[in-house]
Interface confidence: medium
């Protein structure tokens, strides 16, 4: 009986040892697997942390962009309001300009938008001519032309083009007895306008100034005492209609 029990215990012991060995093996495997899983988990945690960090960066960027968008929208609104205000101002100014142009029209004669002369002046090509009704000496005539923003005429636009005398005949009154007008032409060969220095010197030294003289339909350039009282012709370049 004792022997039987002893044998049974030994057999049970062997079974337990085999089971224990198997369990220990399984435990080692599980520990290894658990270690692997812990490592994987660690890796996942790191990845998660990186993802969270990236997300935060993206969120910050998004917030910044959103801030910029809001600033742009505010700017757009401000610009829109400014534009509307300026558009209103422009319309008001255009209206004012239109009114002003209508008020100015009687003071100008225009062949085109580019060639305008003050009212009462005669337009020819790109020049405006004013024939005085009063007589003055040469210096006073020049000063008077200057107060009218012009100079004594040199007929620069018409001379030396052909048939310019036809223009002069239409520009100035007819008269068989002869008409003389002070001019800015000088006595040199090319009939250029004398400069101020030369003019003053000529005036002081010779006291002779130049006039255009008309007899019949002929024009001649002649000298006359600068102190003589004659009508005069002023000339200015035609201008654009004020816009």
């Amino acid at each position: 009986r004792y022997l039987q029990v002893s044998q049974q215990l030994q057999q049970t012991n062997r079974v337990l040892e085999v089971t224990n060995s198997s369990l220990r093996q399984q435990l080692r495997l599980k520990i290894t697997q658990l270690g692997q899983s812990a490592e994987d988990l660690q890796g996942s945690r790191r990845e998660l942390a990186q993802s969270q960090e990236a997300l935060q960066v993206e969120q910050r960027a998004h917030q910044a962009a959103e801030g910029q968008l809001q600033a742009c929208q505010a700017d757009r609104q401000k610009t829109k309001e400014t534009l509307q205000s300026e558009e209103q101002q422009r319309r008001a100014l255009e209206q004012k300009l239109s009114n002003m142009e209508n008020r100015l029209k009687p003071f100008f004669t225009c062949g085109s938008a580019d060639t305008c002369c003050p009212s009462g002046w005669i337009m020819h090509q790109k020049s405006c001519f004013y024939i005085s009704l009063t007589s003055k000496n040469w210096q006073e005539s020049q000063k008077q032309c200057e107060t009218l923003s012009s100079k004594l005429a040199t007929f620069s636009e018409i001379y030396p083009q052909s048939h310019s005398y036809y223009f002069l005949n239409s520009l100035l009154p007819n008269g068989g007895s002869g008409n003389s007008y002070w001019t800015g032409l000088s006595s040199n060969k090319d009939w250029k306008l004398t400069d101020d220095t030369q003019r003053t010197r000529t005036y002081a030294q010779s006291s002779k100034c130049n006039k255009v003289h008309k007899t019949w339909s002929w024009w001649t350039l002649e000298s006359e005492s600068c102190r003589s009282s004659l009508p005069y012709i002023c000339e200015m370049t035609a201008f654009r209609f004020p816009d």
Partner: nanobody, 118 residues
Framework: QVQLQESGGGLVQAGGSLRLSCAAS????????MGWYRQAPGKERELVAG???????YYADSVKGRFTISRDNAKNTVYLQMNSLKPEDTAVYYC????????????WGQGTQVTVSS
């Protein structure tokens, strides 16, 4: 360049006649208006008579009915027939050529003396 040569001047009794001639060279004569001017001592030069390219004529009031201007384009010459001369017609008579396309440019002859004695 236009050259003008006057001839026909001289001394004449009051009531007499003279014919001045002016020959032009160096130009196309037909293109020029021609005139006779005169200048008496101490006086300004004045236009006595003129004839344009269309043969229209002009006379100073003081010579109307007494002087006649004419031109002969074939001979490049302009004439001034002066009748019923008076002492106040005494002057140097100048021939002038006006270029219609160049109003300030006047070509002058040397002048010929006309003296009318009373």
């Amino acid at each position: 360049q236009v050259q003008l040569q006057e001839s026909g001047g001289g001394l004449v009794q009051a009531g007499g006649s003279l014919r001045l001639s002016c020959a032009a060279s160096g130009t196309i004569f037909d293109w020029y208006s021609m005139g006779w001017y005169r200048q008496a001592p101490g006086k300004e030069r004045e236009l006595v008579a003129g004839i344009d390219t269309g043969a229209n004529t002009y006379y100073a009031d003081s010579v109307k009915g007494r002087f006649t201007i004419s031109r002969d384009n074939a001979k490049n010459t302009v004439y001034l027939q002066m009748n019923s001369l008076k002492p106040e017609d005494t002057a140097v008579y100048y021939c002038a050529a006006h270029d219609d396309g160049d109003p300030w440019h006047v070509y002058w002859g040397q002048g010929t003396q006309v003296t009318v004695s009373s």
